[in-house]
Amino acid sequence: MAVTACQGLGFVVSLIGIAGIIAATCMDQWSTQDLYNNPVTAVFNYQGLWRSCVRESSGFTECRGYFTLLGLPAMLQAVRALMIVGIVLGAIGLLVSIFALKCIRIGSMEDSAKANMTLTSGIMFIVSGLCAIAGVSVFANMLVTNFWMSTANMYTGMGGMVQTVQTRYTFGAALFVGWVAGGLTLIGGVMMCIACRGLAPEETNYKAVSYHASGHSVAYKPGGFKASTGFGSNTKNKKIYDGGARTEDEVQSYPSKHDYV
């Protein structure tokens, strides 16, 4: 039962995480205009991975895509690549993990196959989460570097008379969404890997019971162990399935809380 719950929870957490990574990648607010010196501005700038936007006091918002590919900073390209790799791996991981879920029966799929698929999806989620965290961190580092560079020459005066105020950018909402989402995907992946560890040995123990008629098998056959690992009767399996579903429902209440925060 614990394994199923862990697997189900890992799946849901990863699902939320990947949804968050996709959201962060699409968001325009990766960097936002720093308002420290001017908390109330009539023109507010913010930038994403794909376009930059300007919101005027009038409410008019204008966004322009980065239509060049070669003219973009290498770091931005790297961040884009990391986020896309994260999404692709996460999506494949989700697909694999759906079939790996214990509560889903697909033909006569062996539990060892499910264990392998759980491990595979877990690793994919871990790598996906790491890609997202890396991408967001690289962008954040780029922002910090640019921030201090623009602070150093904040005002480039012409004869001290005319001032050109350089726009400084600070962390946007997408960075925090990305970090949290990456973390959730990572946690989900770890949970899947833990669930896999629970799946694999019990399968071996179950086969051992089939093949050995000696007293050895009795030593490996305590009911408590079998019940806890979910290999009892059909009724026990049904209960585990319900438990898993209940856990998933509980986890599904998290996104609303997360969105609210």
Partner: antibody, heavy 118, light 113 residues
Framework: QVQLVQSGAEVKKPGASVKVSCKAS????????INWVKQKTGQGLEWIGE????????YYSEKFRGRATLTADKSISTAYMELSSLRSEDTAVYFC???????????WDQGTTVTVSS | DIVMTQSPSSLAVSLGEMATINCKSS????????????LTWYQQKPGQPPKLLIY???TRESGVPDRFSGSGSGTDFTLTISSLQAEDVAVYYC?????????FGQGTKLERK
């Protein structure tokens, strides 16, 4: 079409307050920011402040902060500008205008003349 | 606050001739995010409210005759009337639309010679 209609001329005594209204029609009132501008006779334009009717956010020129209060009543699509502690130098025409693309004021009303005299 | 300085304060031009009004700001009005200059030009005739002519330094408002054009970037801007018409006699104002408080130039009075 978009139209702004202001209240009539006002004559006030020094120290009193005046509340000028600006009724909007021809568009969704909460869609556009309303700005207030002062113009003394034969002189230039002076920005007082702006109000965002949707959320009620207001921004004021430092010169008018504390004396001018901008409000909006969404139910009757009307913006108000109240100026307190009136002085003789407040004698002017007060305009309300809609802020549009480019933060440009592209619809103006005819203005309300406020005269402060003892 | 951004200070807007217009020159000349008054200008007399013959009908059909070109009129040029300059406006200088104490700070750049160029927004790096969209590479637009937040400078607006208005025309005001006696007894009337101002009328929007040009925004973003060079974008003509719809309905404004094409003899009116705006140019410039950063801190120096120009309003040009290519061929003065009798109805163009008015006071012209430039305005900083970039930062609070929005500030206006002192105005340029355009008269016919």
């Amino acid at each position: 079409q978009v139209q702004l209609v202001q209240s009539g001329a006002e004559v006030k005594k020094p120290g009193a307050s005046v509340k000028v209204s600006c009724k909007a029609s021809g568009y969704t009132f909460t869609s556009y920011v309303i700005n207030w501008v002062k113009q003394k006779t034969g002189q230039g334009l002076e920005w007082i402040g702006e109000i965002h009717p949707r959320g009620g956010n207001t921004y004021y020129s430092e010169k008018f902060r504390g004396r001018a209060t901008l409000t909006a009543d969404k139910s009757i699509s009307t913006a108000y500008m109240e100026l307190s502690s009136l002085r003789s130098e407040d004698t002017a025409v007060y305009f309300c205008a809609i802020l549009r693309r480019g933060n440009a004021m592209d619809y103006w009303d005819q203005g309300t003349t406020v005269t402060v005299s003892s | 606050d951004i200070v807007m300085t217009q020159s000349p304060s008054s200008l007399a031009v013959s009908l059909g001739e070109m009129a040029t009004i300059n406006c200088k700001s104490s700070q750049s009005l160029l927004n790096s995010g969209n590479q637009r200059n937040y400078l607006t030009w208005y025309q005001q005739k006696p007894g009337q409210p101002p009328k929007l002519l040009i925004y973003w330094a060079s974008t003509r408002e719809s309905g404004v005759p094409d003899r009116f054009s705006g140019s410039g970037s950063g801190t120096d801007f120009t309003l040009t009337i290519s061929s003065l018409q009798a109805e163009d006699v008015a006071v012209y104002y430039c305005q900083n639309s970039y930062n609070y408080p929005y500030t206006f130039g002192q105005g340029t009075k355009l008269e016919r010679k």
